[in-house]
C-alpha cells in the first residue's frame, strides 16, 4: 500500500512524495523501492551531515544546477 | 568504473536467432535498468527494451515480441536473444546502462555487429 | 510514442565557427515533477554514443564548457560556442520523460567545410 505524503525536498521535489527514508523513488515504474535497487546515488537532504556518495559516473551539476537538485528520496507522483 | 563489453553478433541468414551478451563489471545488474540499444548502418539510434533490477523487462513494442532480454546475475551478464531475424535487424548492437535518478544511459558497450543477410 | 525532430540532419562548419544544432519533441518534454529529461550525446563513427548534456542544460562531467543546452517544453538547442576539431561528429538529442520507450532524434552530423 502507497504511504501517505511525507514532505517537500528540493527542486526535483514539487509533488510529496511518499518513500519513507530507507526507499527511493524509481521514475521508471513509479513507485518507491528499496534504494539499493537502485544504480545512481540519490543526493542527501538538505542539512545531511555528509556529501552525498558519488561514483565516477554520477557527475556534479555544472550548468543550471541549484542547491537541492536532487534530494532522497526522489517525489512520487501523486 | 563501470564497463560493458558486448559479444556474439555476426553473420546470420534471414528467419534465424542470435544470442547477444552483455557482461558488466564494476556494477552489479541487480541494481538499476540495463538497455539494449541499436543503430542500423547510417542510421540513428533505437532503444530495443531493458531488464531491470528484479528481471522485469520492456521492450520497444515496434519489435513485435521478437526480441527477448535476459540474465545471468551469477555471471552478471545480461543477454538479448533475437528470433525472426530479418535484414531491417542488421546493425550494431550496443548494451547500455541507465542513470535512474537523470534517466540518460551514462555507460555504454562497444557495441557488436549483427548482419542479417543470405 | 514521442517522436524526436533534430535540424539540420547535416551541416558544415569551421573551426571556430558557432554550431547550432535544434530539436524539437512531439509533445512537451515536462515530467509531471518537474523536470525535463531531455539529453544529448555525441558520437563518433565506429565508437559507441558518449552523454554530453542532461536535463537540457546540465554538462556531463569532464565535457568542455563549449558545449550548452539550452530549452524548454518541446524546442531545444545545442550550441558549440567554438567549434573544435574533435568535435566533428554526429549529435543526437534523446527524450526520457515519456518512457518507455526512450526515443532519440535521427542525429545531425556535423562535417568539415
Known amino acids: 500500500m502507497r504511504r501517505g505524503p511525507r514532505s517537500l525536498r528540493g527542486r526535483d521535489a514539487p509533488a510529496p512524495t511518499p518513500c519513507v527514508p530507507a526507499e527511493c523513488f524509481d521514475l521508471l515504474v513509479r513507485h518507491c523501492v528499496a534504494c539499493g535497487l537502485l544504480r545512481t546515488p540519490r543526493p542527501k537532504p538538505a542539512g545531511a551531515s555528509s556529501p552525498a556518495p558519488r561514483t565516477a559516473l554520477q557527475p556534479q551539476e555544472s550548468v543550471g544546477a541549484g542547491a537541492g537538485e536532487a534530494a532522497l528520496p526522489l517525489p512520487g507522483l501523486l | 568504473e563501470v564497463q560493458l563489453v558486448e559479444s556474439g553478433g555476426g553473420l546470420v541468414q534471414p528467419g534465424g536467432s542470435l544470442r547477444l551478451s552483455c557482461a558488466a563489471s564494476?556494477?552489479?545488474?541487480?541494481?538499476?535498468?540495463w538497455n539494449w540499444v541499436r543503430q542500423a548502418p547510417g542510421k540513428g539510434l533505437e532503444w530495443v527494451g531493458y531488464?531491470?533490477?528484479?528481471?522485469?523487462?520492456y521492450y520497444n513494442p515496434s519489435l513485435k515480441s521478437r526480441f527477448t532480454i535476459s540474465r545471468d546475475t551469477s555471471k552478471n551478464t545480461f543477454y538479448l536473444q533475437m528470433n525472426s531475424l530479418r535484414a531491417e535487424d542488421t546493425a550494431v548492437y550496443y548494451c547500455?546502462?541507465?542513470?535512474?535518478?537523470?534517466?540518460?544511459?551514462?555507460?555504454w558497450g562497444q557495441g557488436t555487429l549483427v548482419t542479417v543477410s543470405s | 510514442d514521442i517522436q524526436m525532430t533534430q535540424s539540420p540532419s547535416s551541416l558544415s562548419a569551421s573551426v571556430g565557427d558557432r554550431v547550432t544544432i535544434t530539436c524539437r519533441s512531439s509533445?512537451?518534454?515536462?515530467?509531471?515533477?518537474?523536470?525535463?529529461?531531455l539529453h544529448w550525446y555525441q558520437q563518433k563513427p565506429g565508437k559507441a554514443p558518449k552523454l554530453l548534456i542532461y536535463?537540457?542544460?546540465n554538462r556531463f562531467s569532464g565535457v568542455p564548457s563549449r558545449f550548452s543546452g539550452s530549452g524548454s517544453g518541446t524546442d531545444f538547442t545545442l550550441t558549440i560556442s567554438s567549434l573544435q576539431p574533435e568535435d566533428f561528429a554526429t549529435y543526437y538529442c534523446?527524450?526520457?520523460?515519456?518512457?518507455?520507450?526512450?526515443?532519440f532524434g535521427q542525429g545531425t552530423k556535423v562535417e568539415i567545410k
Open positions: 534523446s527524450q526520457s520523460t515519456h518512457v518507455p520507450p526512450f526515443t
Open positions: 531488464i531491470s533490477y528484479s528481471g522485469s523487462t
Open positions: 547500455a546502462g541507465l542513470n535512474d535518478l537523470y534517466l540518460y544511459f551514462d555507460v
Open positions: 509533445q512537451s518534454l515536462v515530467h509531471s515533477n518537474g523536470n525535463t529529461y
Open positions: 564494476g556494477d552489479s545488474i541487480t541494481s538499476g535498468y
Open positions: 536535463k537540457v542544460s
